[in-house]
């Protein structure tokens, strides 16, 4: 898999979800003690992880393949998908128990309560997605993925409720992108700034990704999009498969559908 | 190239309030942590507290809890630290100095400093 | 609070002498960093993660230590090296400074 932006392309590994996240020291892997570990969340405004918080975590796709200390000196780290090079083939926390010794070095596995949290992977019919904070104004340096995968046979039907991202000419510094895919490397629809609603895109099979990124200045409303799956039906009664293809800034660029 | 550019010299009453600037130059403000410090004529240096500019989180070494309030506005890439009830023991210099928010940390830029004199 | 002790507080040293000052800490650290501080004007970071050093500063500078103990060296000292030089923790709640190693010239 490739790695690209807090994601593994091709899966569904997130770097952050439900308010936990990942952390090595400066000098690399499996290098803070229990104290230090501790130390690293509560100067992020958290602290250690629960084994709780990070099984919650790891069932909306939180997969890193590192052993952290938790809270309570416990050690272990989260698999969504079994692979030879990690989890011995395993899926779920990799527990190494609550260690005797506290002075053993591991990476961290903190929990943010403050968190403005966004992303994730979504199975449900009917579901909105909101820029963190909406409708208060995002922040800067966000990035979140949303993960749609509904049942087979099901598209998915995408609508813009509220958009309001700063405007840039090449949507380069705000943006939303859609996939009409599981990753954000195929499939790619349009990307999406300013503040004139997109119109509705409907997706070519089950699945849909969309991400929204903003940069280090500058940040505005946000945004609300909603998806409701749609039934199979007869090609005659279809929606149009494809994205909008206005000019200007609200779609930056409009690729063509790749099917799955 | 990275800069931090600190409001000049102060001069204050005991019980009154003063707000130091701090303006970042040359690095992305959001990407980095801001961290304030203390030194009092002839003495070291003593670590007060930082804010995390992205989020706005802040945290203050205990003595300083109810000292310093630390702020930060994205829009000038400028972190404050508003120092209350001023005391003659308040007199220092005061330096502003980034971290990267990697651990351990240390911080690898300084502000010139600003001197706050408190007389009455 | 991790209590860092410099020592000596103010040492001298002629021209191309080695020169040796340490810190000790009150609760062991994986990583030590070094300051120099000149008359009137900010600190610089001087040594990062124990022994790496910062930009610019000259390769007589060593740093070296684990644990409790640490120190910073300089191979042959120079005038330009005259300055006070403080160790500072980065790893536990709250951050803290040495009190410092004046050094001057002989």
């Known amino acids: 898999w490739g790695f690209k932006d807090g994601i593994f392309h091709n899966s569904i590994w997130l770097e952050r979800a439900a308010g936990v996240y990942h952390r090595e020291a400066r000098s690399g892997k499996y290098k803070l003690t229990y104290a230090e570990a501790k130390a690293v969340c509560e100067f992020e405004g958290g602290h250690l992880a629960t084994y709780k918080q990070l099984e919650a975590a790891r069932k909306i796709g939180f997969h890193v393949c590192a052993a952290g200390w938790m809270a309570k000196g416990r050690v272990g780290y989260p698999i969504v998908k079994p692979g030879p090079n990690c989890g011995f083939g395993k899926t779920g926390i990799i527990d190494y128990g609550i260690r005797l010794n506290r002075s053993e070095r591991w990476d961290a596995y903190c929990y943010n309560p403050h968190a403005k949290e966004c992303g994730g992977v979504f199975t449900d019919p009917k579901q909105i997605f909101k820029s963190p904070g909406f409708p208060n104004e995002y922040e800067d340096n966000q990035i979140c993925y949303w993960h749609i995968r509904l049942k087979y046979g099901q598209r998915i039907h995408l609508s813009f409720l509220d958009f309001d991202l700063e405007d840039d000419p090449g949507c380069l510094a705000d943006y939303v992108e859609i996939y009409d895919s599981y990753d954000d490397v195929h499939g790619f629809v349009g990307r999406y700034c300013g503040d004139e609603l997109p119109d509705d895109i409907i997706s070519t099979g089950n699945v849909m990704t969309l991400k929204f990124l903003s940069d280090a200045s500058v940040t505005a409303g946000g945004f609300q999009i909603k998806y409701v799956a749609m039934d199979p039906v007869s090609k005659s009664s279809q929606g149009k498969n494809t994205s909008t293809t206005s000019t200007g800034n609200k779609n930056f660029l409009a690729g063509r559908f790749s099917h799955l | 190239q990275v800069r931090l550019q600190q409001s000049g010299a102060e001069l204050a009453k005991p019980g009154a309030s003063v707000k130091l600037s701090c303006k970042a130059s040359?690095?992305?403000?959001?990407?980095?942590?801001m961290h304030w410090v203390k030194q009092r004529p002839g003495q070291g240096l003593e670590w007060i507290g930082y804010?995390?500019?992205?989020?706005?989180?802040?945290k203050n070494k205990q003595n300083f809890k109810d000292k310093a309030t630390l702020t930060a506005d994205k829009s000038s890439s400028t972190a404050y630290m508003q120092l209350s009830n001023l005391t003659y023991e308040d007199s220092a210099v005061y330096s502003c100095a980034r971290s990267d928010g990697s651990y351990p940390y240390y911080f690898d830029y300084w502000g010139q400093g600003t001197t706050l004199t408190v007389s009455s | 609070e991790n209590v860092l002790t410099q020592s000596p507080a103010i040492m001298s040293a002629s021209p191309g002498e080695k020169v040796t000052m340490t810190c000790s800490a009150s609760s062991s650290v994986s990583y030590m960093h070094w300051y120099q501080q000149k008359s009137s004007t900010s600190p610089k970071l001087w040594i990062y993660d124990t022994s790496k050093l910062a930009s610019g500063v000259p390769g007589r500078f060593s740093g070296s230590g684990s644990g409790n103990s640490y120190s910073l060296t300089i191979s042959s000292m120079e005038a330009e090296d005259v300055a006070t030089y403080y160790c500072?923790?980065?790893?536990?709640?709250?951050?803290?400074f040495g009190s410092g190693t004046k050094l001057e010239i002989k």
């Open positions: 804010i995390i500019p992205s989020s706005g989180y802040t």
């Open positions: 040359g690095y992305t403000f959001t990407s980095y942590w």
């Open positions: 500072f923790q980065g790893s536990g709640y709250p951050l803290t």
